[in-house]
Interface confidence: low
Protein backbone atom coordinates (compact mmCIF):
# COMPACT_ATOMS: atom_id res chain seq x y z
CA UNK A 1 0.00 0.00 0.00
CA UNK A 2 1.06 3.72 -0.97
CA UNK A 3 2.43 6.29 2.14
CA UNK A 4 -0.34 7.90 3.53
CA UNK A 5 -1.18 11.21 2.51
CA UNK A 6 -0.12 13.89 4.30
CA UNK A 7 -1.95 16.37 2.76
CA UNK A 8 -4.64 17.95 5.61
CA UNK A 9 -6.52 19.61 2.69
CA UNK A 10 -9.94 17.54 1.52
CA UNK A 11 -11.02 18.34 -1.81
CA UNK A 12 -14.03 17.23 -3.92
CA UNK A 13 -13.79 15.63 -7.62
CA UNK A 14 -17.30 15.07 -8.28
CA UNK A 15 -20.31 16.48 -7.49
CA UNK A 16 -23.53 14.20 -6.39
CA UNK A 17 -25.92 14.12 -8.98
CA UNK A 18 -28.96 13.51 -6.56
CA UNK A 19 -30.86 15.72 -4.54
CA UNK A 20 -30.16 15.06 -0.33
CA UNK A 21 -33.00 15.12 1.62
CA UNK A 22 -32.67 17.79 4.26
CA UNK A 23 -33.63 15.41 6.89
CA UNK A 24 -30.33 13.08 6.19
CA UNK A 25 -28.32 16.06 6.62
CA UNK A 26 -26.07 16.73 9.68
CA UNK A 27 -23.96 19.17 9.14
CA UNK A 28 -21.70 20.87 6.28
CA UNK A 29 -18.55 22.51 5.50
CA UNK A 30 -17.39 24.81 2.75
CA UNK A 31 -14.41 23.43 0.36
CA UNK A 32 -12.80 26.85 -0.55
CA UNK A 33 -8.99 25.93 -0.97
CA UNK A 34 -7.04 26.56 -4.02
CA UNK A 35 -5.84 23.13 -3.94
CA UNK A 36 -9.02 21.67 -4.38
CA UNK A 37 -10.01 21.32 -8.37
CA UNK A 38 -13.80 22.68 -7.36
CA UNK A 39 -15.48 24.82 -5.12
CA UNK A 40 -17.65 22.35 -3.23
CA UNK A 41 -20.14 21.85 -0.29
CA UNK A 42 -19.44 18.66 1.52
CA UNK A 43 -22.70 17.37 3.91
CA UNK A 44 -21.84 14.94 6.67
CA UNK A 45 -25.39 12.70 6.69
CA UNK A 46 -26.75 11.43 9.89
CA UNK A 47 -24.70 8.19 8.99
CA UNK A 48 -21.79 10.38 9.19
CA UNK A 49 -21.29 9.77 5.38
CA UNK A 50 -19.47 12.86 3.88
CA UNK A 51 -21.34 13.98 -0.08
CA UNK A 52 -19.70 16.32 -1.65
CA UNK A 53 -22.16 18.57 -3.39
CA UNK A 54 -22.30 21.65 -5.92
CA UNK A 55 -22.72 25.29 -3.90
CA UNK A 56 -24.04 26.55 -7.04
CA UNK A 57 -27.08 24.30 -7.12
CA UNK A 58 -29.77 26.04 -5.52
CA UNK A 59 -30.95 22.93 -3.21
CA UNK A 60 -27.48 23.14 -1.93
CA UNK A 61 -27.62 26.46 -0.47
CA UNK A 62 -31.44 25.84 0.65
CA UNK A 63 -29.60 22.68 2.56
CA UNK A 64 -27.14 24.96 3.80
CA UNK A 65 -29.85 27.88 5.42
CA UNK A 66 -31.30 24.89 6.70
CA UNK A 67 -28.54 23.52 8.91
CA UNK A 68 -27.39 27.14 9.69
CA UNK A 69 -31.01 27.97 11.16
CA UNK A 70 -30.97 23.98 13.21
CA UNK A 71 -27.37 25.28 14.43
CA UNK A 72 -28.65 28.31 15.55
CA UNK A 73 -32.21 27.66 16.92
CA UNK A 74 -31.19 25.83 20.88
CA UNK A 75 -33.40 22.40 21.01
CA UNK A 76 -35.41 22.18 23.94
CA UNK B 1 -13.17 -9.64 0.80
CA UNK B 2 -12.51 -7.02 -1.69
CA UNK B 3 -9.58 -7.39 -3.95
CA UNK B 4 -7.85 -5.53 -6.81
CA UNK B 5 -5.36 -7.05 -8.78
CA UNK B 6 -3.44 -4.87 -11.50
CA UNK B 7 -1.76 -5.48 -14.48
CA UNK B 8 -0.23 -4.22 -17.62
CA UNK B 9 2.57 -2.45 -16.02
CA UNK B 10 6.10 -2.53 -18.44
CA UNK B 11 8.79 -0.74 -20.03
CA UNK B 12 7.67 1.62 -22.75
CA UNK B 13 9.55 4.21 -24.71
CA UNK B 14 8.40 8.08 -23.87
CA UNK B 15 5.96 8.95 -26.52
CA UNK B 16 4.06 5.16 -26.14
CA UNK B 17 0.92 3.87 -24.68
CA UNK B 18 0.29 1.27 -22.36
CA UNK B 19 -2.99 -0.04 -21.14
CA UNK B 20 -3.33 -1.04 -17.05
CA UNK B 21 -5.56 -3.20 -16.03
CA UNK B 22 -7.53 -3.17 -12.21
CA UNK B 23 -9.51 -7.08 -11.80
CA UNK B 24 -11.82 -6.46 -8.66
CA UNK B 25 -13.51 -9.47 -6.80
CA UNK B 26 -15.48 -9.35 -3.78
CA UNK B 27 -18.15 -6.63 -4.26
CA UNK B 28 -19.49 -5.29 -7.94
CA UNK B 29 -19.29 -1.97 -9.21
CA UNK B 30 -22.79 -1.01 -8.83
CA UNK B 31 -21.99 0.97 -5.85
CA UNK B 32 -18.40 1.96 -5.91
CA UNK B 33 -16.01 4.36 -7.61
CA UNK B 34 -12.49 2.91 -8.45
CA UNK B 35 -9.52 5.61 -8.78
CA UNK B 36 -6.01 5.37 -9.87
CA UNK B 37 -2.95 6.41 -8.04
CA UNK B 38 1.17 6.77 -8.63
CA UNK B 39 4.13 6.31 -6.73
CA UNK B 40 7.30 7.45 -7.83
CA UNK B 41 10.89 6.24 -6.35
CA UNK B 42 11.18 8.27 -3.21
CA UNK B 43 8.00 10.61 -3.70
CA UNK B 44 4.58 11.18 -1.85
CA UNK B 45 2.05 9.03 -3.44
CA UNK B 46 -0.14 10.89 -6.47
CA UNK B 47 -3.84 10.92 -7.08
CA UNK B 48 -6.37 10.27 -7.73
CA UNK B 49 -5.03 10.76 -11.08
CA UNK B 50 -8.43 9.77 -12.34
CA UNK B 51 -11.82 8.18 -10.80
CA UNK B 52 -14.67 6.23 -12.58
CA UNK B 53 -18.29 5.85 -10.30
CA UNK B 54 -20.79 3.59 -10.74
CA UNK B 55 -22.77 6.85 -11.66
CA UNK B 56 -20.55 7.35 -15.12
CA UNK B 57 -18.74 9.83 -13.85
CA UNK B 58 -15.22 10.78 -14.40
CA UNK B 59 -12.58 12.68 -12.91
CA UNK B 60 -8.78 13.04 -14.55
CA UNK B 61 -6.29 15.01 -12.78
CA UNK B 62 -4.50 18.21 -14.71
CA UNK B 63 -1.33 16.28 -14.75
CA UNK B 64 -3.22 12.99 -17.07
CA UNK B 65 -6.22 14.89 -18.81
CA UNK B 66 -5.83 14.20 -21.88
CA UNK B 67 -3.45 11.30 -22.25
CA UNK B 68 -4.92 9.13 -19.45
CA UNK B 69 -8.50 7.42 -20.12
CA UNK B 70 -10.38 5.23 -17.37
CA UNK B 71 -13.11 3.11 -18.48
CA UNK B 72 -14.63 -0.02 -17.28
CA UNK B 73 -16.09 -3.38 -17.98
CA UNK B 74 -18.76 -3.95 -15.70
CA UNK B 75 -19.05 -7.77 -17.02
CA UNK B 76 -15.38 -8.65 -16.13
CA UNK B 77 -15.35 -6.71 -12.74
CA UNK B 78 -12.03 -4.28 -14.56
CA UNK B 79 -11.11 -1.08 -14.54
CA UNK B 80 -8.69 -0.05 -17.38
CA UNK B 81 -6.68 2.96 -17.34
CA UNK B 82 -5.24 3.33 -21.07
CA UNK B 83 -2.31 5.59 -21.01
CA UNK B 84 -0.86 7.33 -24.11
CA UNK B 85 1.85 9.88 -24.60
CA UNK B 86 3.53 8.69 -21.84
CA UNK B 87 6.18 10.90 -20.29
CA UNK B 88 9.63 10.00 -18.22
CA UNK B 89 8.13 11.34 -15.34
CA UNK B 90 4.87 8.75 -15.47
CA UNK B 91 7.54 6.53 -14.71
CA UNK B 92 5.65 5.17 -10.56
CA UNK B 93 4.22 2.38 -9.20
CA UNK B 94 0.26 2.27 -10.29
CA UNK B 95 -2.11 1.38 -7.46
CA UNK B 96 -5.71 1.25 -8.29
CA UNK B 97 -7.99 1.61 -5.33
CA UNK B 98 -11.90 1.34 -4.82
CA UNK B 99 -14.58 2.49 -2.08
CA UNK B 100 -17.97 1.97 -1.67
CA UNK B 101 -20.15 5.27 -2.15
CA UNK B 102 -22.45 4.40 0.99
CA UNK B 103 -25.57 3.69 1.45
CA UNK B 104 -27.32 6.93 -0.58
CA UNK B 105 -24.08 5.93 -3.76
CA UNK B 106 -24.58 9.91 -4.18
CA UNK B 107 -21.71 11.30 -4.87
CA UNK B 108 -17.95 10.35 -5.52
CA UNK B 109 -15.78 9.86 -2.47
CA UNK B 110 -13.32 12.28 -0.94
CA UNK B 111 -9.48 11.32 -2.26
CA UNK B 112 -8.79 9.79 1.40
CA UNK B 113 -12.11 7.83 1.12
CA UNK B 114 -10.47 5.01 -0.67
CA UNK B 115 -10.02 1.50 1.74
CA UNK B 116 -9.18 -1.27 -0.62
CA UNK B 117 -5.61 -1.10 -2.68
CA UNK B 118 -4.27 -3.20 -4.90
CA UNK B 119 -0.64 -4.58 -4.87
CA UNK B 120 0.75 -2.01 -7.63
CA UNK B 121 1.83 -2.79 -11.18
CA UNK B 122 5.00 -0.97 -12.22
CA UNK B 123 5.32 1.68 -14.68
CA UNK B 124 8.79 2.82 -16.77
CA UNK B 125 9.13 5.33 -19.42
CA UNK B 126 12.61 5.55 -21.12
CA UNK B 127 13.80 8.70 -22.72
Known amino acids: QPDAINAPVTCCYNFTNRKISVQRLASYRRITSSKCPKEAVIFKTIVAKEICADPKQKWVQDSMDHLDKQTQTPKT | EVQLVESGGGLVQAGGSLRLSCAAS????????IGWFRQAPGKEREGPLCISSSDGSTYYADSVKGRFTISSDNAKNTVYLQMNSLKPEDTAVYYC????????????????????WGQGTQVTVSS
Open chain 2, 26 to 33: GFTFDDYA
Open chain 2, 97 to 116: AAESLGDYGLASPLPADFGS
